[in-house]
Amino acid sequence: MMTGTIETTGNISAEKGGSIILQCHLSSTTAQVTQVNWEQQDQLLAICNADLGWHISPSFKDRVAPGPGLGLTLQSLTVNDTGEYFCIYHTYPDGTYTGRIFLEVLESSVAEHGARFQIP
């Protein structure tokens, strides 16, 4: 029986040109994590394997940094990075757990505007 739960950073926003840490945490299970996949929609960003370490997809190599822990840091953000991200935990003996994060990348001026003027 799968008893674990995935905690994620949920819905997050960041400024264009900035960076953001995507994090998921698997808790409430003693299952061994054998691999974590990070995906954006259907595109693989990175794999963190318990025996082989990290593999960053070549197309993301220059602006993805592994960590902290099993998390992933996205750098030099563009508006095209807006969307859904998934952390897929492969565990033994439980099986697969999936977490979802929605990232919105904002134009700098929009982010500043949003911070200064709040709609009541």
Epitope: E7, H25, C48, A50, G53, W54, I56, D62, A65
Partner: antibody
């Protein structure tokens, strides 16, 4: 077999700089963080920073920014740490340790640095 | 920065005793907590990863538990080779940090 082989004991003068190395074998250095940890005699462990040789990303403990510089030569499977403007407080054993997301699972034997005039 | 506080600083036990070492985080770190053992004049050794996950080659008498801010390393029936220092470390956020350590000594 995974091994991290660190360079030998260093004796340096105050104000000098030293560079130590950590030679990795038995795995791909580009798939793991290489962290550096300081341990003063009889004291605890202090994280200095880490480098991810896969794309040269670095993270530093704010306390060691300007003191430590981390580099890696992937073709030689080696990580390096340079310490500058040495003082007595820098006298310690420095460990390199690899991390692939699942804890720091392999450690070097340590490089002892003594700063003395 | 996440501050990790270990207690007690020193634990005096007799071989065969079972002991619990504590590590408390200054903020929630989920289960991103690892335990290390360091014997005198040796490098640290990873004992437990992610609070409770076992490490290949580590005796089964070592176990970990906890989540959030409170974590425990348990040693079931301490053996003479277990005496030394124990450190916790978090990988929840940069900068990584270590606890101050617990010294396990022979009574």
């Amino acid at each position: 077999e995974v091994q991290l082989q660190q360079s030998g004991t260093v004796l340096a003068r105050p104000g000098a700089s030293v560079k130590m190395s950590c030679k990795a074998s038995g795995y791909s250095i580009t798939s793991y963080w290489m962290h550096w940890v300081k341990q003063r005699p009889g004291q605890g462990l202090e994280w200095i920073g880490g480098i991810y040789p896969g794309n040269s990303n670095t993270n530093y403990n704010q306390k060691f920014k300007g003191k430590a510089k981390l580099t890696a030569v992937t073709s030689a499977s080696t990580a390096n740490m340079e310490l500058s403007s040495l003082t007595n407080e820098d006298s310690a054993v420095y460990y390199c340790t690899r991390e692939g997301g699942y804890g720091m699972d392999y450690w070097g034997q340590g490089t002892s640095v003594t700063v003395s005039s | 920065d996440v501050v990790l506080t270990q207690s007690p600083a020193t634990l005096s036990v007799t071989p065969g005793d079972s002991v619990s070492l504590s590590c408390r985080a200054s903020q929630t770190i989920s289960n991103n907590l690892h335990w290390y053992q360091q014997k005198s004049h040796e490098s640290p050794r990873l004992l437990i990863k992610y609070s409770s996950q076992s490490i290949s080659g580590i005796p089964s008498r070592f176990s970990g538990s906890g989540s959030g801010t409170d974590f425990t390393l348990s040693i079931n029936s301490v053996e003479t080779e277990d005496f030394g220092m124990y450190f916790c470390q978090q990988s929840y956020s940069w900068p990584y940090t270590f606890g101050g350590g617990t010294k396990l000594e022979i009574k």
